[in-house]
Interface confidence: low
């Protein structure tokens, strides 16, 4: 029997250039008579053009929704009703070719062609893109608040904020023909629920979305987005009602930046330079293609690429890479944004060098990618350390912490977190090394204590990059480094002349002179520790709530002991900068550290002094008794303490704690407490210091109060941010 043919709606979006008309400002106002008149004529022309081709039989509807420069550009959409079996045959490319063919066939014709009655359409200026009914609905929802802006070369145009009576607005942006648009978004409120989407075309086509951002992102307070060319659309969707714009948008045209380079590396190890996508840290543009060729001086070396918060992964099947495609020596890899460092190590087998290609495979892009490159020794990639094959990083081996996700850095250890005697592989505890007393059979623990040694897990690295064997030599009053750098920056960690945390006791004035109280509107929220004249360290989770993210809210008190009264040694500061660790992850508590820059430097006194920061190699031995201090609750669920409490806690081996917390303990965490419970940090202690006393009498910051199950519960230790795990970031910021 006869079966009716199934018809489907195919939606196209596009633009065409009219050579005999000029754009005027009147055409940006949809309510103007000029706009109404021009759209009527343009719509008629568009319909006539489509129906002049063999697409005419499928024509359903069309609309010209906007105009732009060039001399006059019309932006439109149209719908064809196509038999289902023909759907794939009428791709945007085919439709564009049919329309261009029609335009070219009439260019030199003297015959009367309806669509040429008023408009001279440029065949080369026609663009047809795939769209959907959903895209048209999204476009229509913005037409009540539609803004067109042309931005000229050398201009930076600040866009007018959205109309808050509308629920959605669209900025249609256009720049000079051979340039690309760069949009800058700056969030200006601490919290909002607004949504912004940026498109690589004039309208909100889902398939041409560059990126979308939501709700006054604190992770990215400023976002810069690059289009692939001179056209871009930004769509705003209203969040909570607000009389203030929660963001500022500005746009500028920029020239295309070549992304090709030939480099020859020097005969030395470590980082030698940086490769990055154009206009880094701007988002890379939808049609980015970079090609970097690096030549290695010798086959002894491999090439290392060190990424920050970005990793390369093998993509199963041939799915497109959504966060950038990489080809390295004919291997296809996909980029993936992660909250961790990562290194890709490329073995070199030929002197021809290595070509690295980066391509944005889809229109959806992301933050610009930057990579440090350098060489590594192929026969010994990680001198004194362990090469973690999972992430390409060199990590400490056999230190009691599984730094590598697969834990292989802690496998096959003869001596874990101890020193291995040369003569018989006996293990001795680290504080016994270079302490002047031989503990190994032939005294190998006391050898090479006055000279440089190869760098390793527990060696201290001096400023001149040489290493010393003595563990924890910092600020012990004896220079161990040739350059004396182990005794520099030692004005720290000394208690003032002075003599609740769960299970604690009251502290006296000056006993913990680095202790900070972080307050909002006179209320103690978190603890912290003074680490330098203008820097206080605390936990990132103290700023987790959007309402706590603004620096203006916070006051930092130093030298404080009692919450309900002040004494002469107490000083207060406003916060000029708040920096959360870039890898901080709220859900996992990983990298739970933040730095507050004070509005003016501290004046040191008996009651206000910084704590000492440990080197990355500093070893805090499990079993060591250390101290936590704070004004937190004295019992689970209780109110905060009026007096600064102190309590001793024992450092717990990482694997034991990891098991208690079902493997949620990362290498950036350290556990302390007692299986008995009782002595622990509690709510309000967050961000406060866990300090351990060195033999020199100086106190070193081992951890920051981070998380735990309840307070003082048996079998559940307190979990602290491990300072040695985040020290490189701290030093980078503070110095």
């Amino acid at each position: 029997g006869y079966k009716a043919e199934v018809m489907v709606s195919q939606v196209y979006s596009g633009s065409l250039r009219v050579l005999n008309r000029h754009f005027s400002q009147d055409l940006t106002r949809r309510e103007s008579s000029a706009f109404r008149s021009e759209t009527a004529k343009a719509q008629k022309m568009l319909k006539e053009l489509i129906t002049s081709t063999r697409l005419g039989t499928y024509y359903n509807s069309s609309s010209v929704y906007s105009f732009g420069e060039g001399p006059l550009t019309c932006f439109f959409w149209f719908i064809l009703q196509i038999p289902e079996h023909r759907r794939l045959m009428l791709s945007p490319e085919v439709v564009q070719a049919l329309l261009v063919e029609e335009l070219l066939s009439t260019v030199n014709s003297s015959a009367a062609v309806p669509y040429r009655a008023e408009y001279e359409v440029d065949p080369e200026g026609l663009v047809i893109l795939e769209a959907s009914v959903k895209d048209i609905a999204a476009l229509n929802s913005t037409l009540g608040c539609y803004r067109y802006s042309y931005v000229g070369q050398g201009q930076v145009l600040r866009l007018k904020g959205p109309d808050h009576l509308a629920s959605s607005c669209l900025w249609h942006l256009q720049g000079p023909k051979d340039l690309m648009l760069k949009l800058r978004l700056e969030w200006t409120l601490a919290e909002c629920r607004d949504r912004l989407a940026m498109y690589d075309v004039a309208g909100p086509l889902e398939k041409r979305l560059i990126t979308s951002v939501y709700g006054c992102s604190r992770q990215e307070p400023v976002v810069e987005v690059l289009a692939s060319g001179a056209i871009m659309a930004v769509v705003w969707k209203k969040g909570l009602h607000s009389y203030y714009d929660p963001f500022v948008l500005s746009v500028q045209p920029v020239v295309f930046q070549a992304c090709e380079v030939n480099l020859t590396l020097d005969n030395r190890l470590d980082s030698q330079g940086v490769l990055s996508t154009p206009y880094f840290p701007s988002y890379y543009s939808p049609q980015t293609h970079c090609s970097w060729h690096l030549t290695v001086p010798s086959l002894d070396y491999g090439l290392a690429l060190w990424f920050d918060a970005y990793a390369l992964r093998r993509q199963k099947y041939d799915l497109p890479c959504t966060q950038g495609q990489w080809t390295i020596q004919n291997r296809r890899l996909c980029g993936l944004r992660i909250l961790q460092p990562y290194a890709e190590r490329i073995p070199v087998v030929a002197t021809a060098g290595i070509t690295i290609n980066f391509t944005s495979q889809i229109s959806l892009t992301g933050p610009g990618v930057r990579v440090h490159y350098g060489l590594y020794n192929q026969s010994d990639p990680c001198p004194g350390e362990f090469l973690c094959s999972v992430n390409g990083l060199c990590v400490p081996a056999c230190d009691g912490v599984k730094d590598c996700p697969n834990g292989l850095d802690e496998r096959n250890c003869v001596c874990r977190a101890t020193f291995q005697c040369k003569e018989d592989s006996t293990c001795i505890s680290l504080p016994k090394v270079c302490d002047g007393q031989p503990d190994c059979l032939n005294g190998s623990d006391e050898e090479q204590c006055q000279e440089g040694v190869p760098c390793g897990t527990f060696t201290f690295q001096c400023e001149d990059r040489s290493c010393v064997k003595k563990p924890n030599p910092q600020c012990d009053g004896r220079p161990d480094c040739r350059d004396g750098s182990d005794e520099e920056h030692c004005d720290c960690g000394l208690q003032g002349p002075s003599s609740r945390i769960v299970g604690g006791a009251v502290s006296s004035e000056g006993e913990w002179p680095w202790q900070a109280s972080l307050q909002v509107r006179g209320r103690h929220i978190c603890g912290g520790a003074l680490i330098a004249d203008r820097w206080v360290i605390t936990a990132a989770h103290c700023f987790q709530e959007d309402s706590m993210a603004s620096t203006v809210l916070w006051t930092v008190f130093l030298g404080k002991v009692w919450q309900n009264s002040r004494w002469p040694g107490e000083v207060s500061f406003k916060v000029s900068r708040l920096l959360l660790h870039p890898y901080h992850e709220e859900d996992s508590h990983d990298y739970d550290v933040a730095l507050l820059q004070l509005d003016h430097p501290v004046v040191r006194s008996a009651a206000v002094r910084p704590v000492c920061l440990p080197a990355r190699s500093h070893f805090f031995e499990p079993g060591l008794h250390c101290w936590i201090t704070g004004w937190g609750a004295l019992r689970e669920g209780g109110p905060i303490s009026n007096a600064l409490q102190k309590v001793d806690v024992q450092l717990i081996p990482q694997d034991l704690c990891s098991e208690v917390y079902r493997y949620q303990v990362t290498p950036r965490m350290l556990c302390a407490g007692y299986r008995k419970g009782k002595k622990d940090a509690c709510q309000g202690d967050s961000g406060g210091p866990l300090v351990c006393k060195a033999l020199s009498g100086r106190w070193f910051l081992a951890g920051l109060v981070s998380w735990g199950l309840g307070c003082g519960r048996p079998n559940y230790f307190g979990v602290y941010t491990r300072i040695t795990g985040v020290i490189s970031w701290i030093q980078q910021v503070v110095t």
């Epitope: 977190a417 499990p622 079993g623 081996p653 034991l656 098991e659 008995k676 048996p714």
Partner: antibody, heavy 118, light 107 residues
Framework: QVQLVQSGAEVKKPGASVKVSCKAS????????MHWVRQAPGQRLEWMGR????????TYSPKFQGRVTIIPDTSANTAYMELSSLRSEDTAVYYC???????????WGQGTLVTVSS | DIQMTQSPKSLSASVGDRVTITCRAS??????LAWYQQKPGQSPKLLIY???TRHSGVPSRFSGSGSGTDFTLTISSLQPEDFATYYC?????????FGQGTKLEIK
């Protein structure tokens, strides 16, 4: 210095109970766990249970649960272990020991021989 | 309960020898393992805890290693006072359990 001094040897009949004391000096028992471990002749050491004298919280080995009771007297800095329903296989040397929270038992008493015989 | 198995059950050695005693746990005890020395008629003395940490006053010839389920006590050079019975104990979870002991005798 740290010392744990236990009460003297005891001879008991089957079905009876025995109570052994352990007096601490050189430290405060409230800061430690106090454990009881026994060793039958020629046998391995066997952990019986522990108490946290600070709050009286006890943990017993399932093998002795219901028969053993450990109690502290913090004013006398002494811990006691009582074992009831004695049988001949309870003949052993009973030791008290202390530990700091997670760590194992670092100091032990001299032991008390309990003989169960009809 | 976690079972602790020591080997050998007994061993003969001479003064100056290097001696190794092993202990295996029936399940992972991380590094929560202790070694004790016991002489006839005396109470046990703690030698090593947390698998590798020597108790205060313990000579450096005693060392411990291992983690997870397999552990080793090494006496690098036997002295006359070292002949005794050695026990391992897991201090990972209650009920705490001991190995059956290794008797170290003079050859």
């Amino acid at each position: 210095q740290v010392q744990l001094v236990q009460s003297g040897a005891e001879v008991k009949k089957p079905g009876a109970s025995v109570k052994v004391s352990c007096k601490a000096s050189g430290f405060n028992i409230e800061d430690y766990y106090m454990h009881w471990v026994r060793q039958a002749p020629g046998q391995r050491l066997e952990w019986m249970g522990r108490i946290d004298p600070e709050d009286g919280e006890t943990t017993y080995s399932p093998k002795f649960q219901g028969r053993v009771t450990i109690i502290p007297d913090t004013s006398a800095n002494t811990a006691y272990m009582e074992l009831s329903s004695l049988r001949s296989e309870d003949t052993a040397v009973y030791y008290c020991a202390r530990s700091i929270y997670l760590d194992p038992m670092d100091y032990w008493g001299q032991g008390t021989l309990v003989t169960v015989s009809s | 309960d976690i079972q602790m198995t020591q080997s050998p059950k007994s061993l003969s050695a001479s003064v100056g020898d290097r001696v190794t005693i092993t202990c295996r746990a029936s399940q992972d005890v991380t590094t929560a393992l202790a070694w004790y020395q016991q002489k006839p008629g005396q109470s046990p003395k703690l030698l090593i805890y947390w698998a590798t940490t020597r108790h205060s006053g313990v000579p450096s010839r005693f060392s411990g290693s291992g983690s997870g389920t397999d552990f080793t006590l090494t006496i690098s050079s036997l002295q006359p006072e070292d002949f005794a019975t050695y026990y391992c104990q897991q201090h990972y979870s209650t009920p705490y359990t001991f190995g059956q002991g290794t008797k170290l005798e003079i050859k």
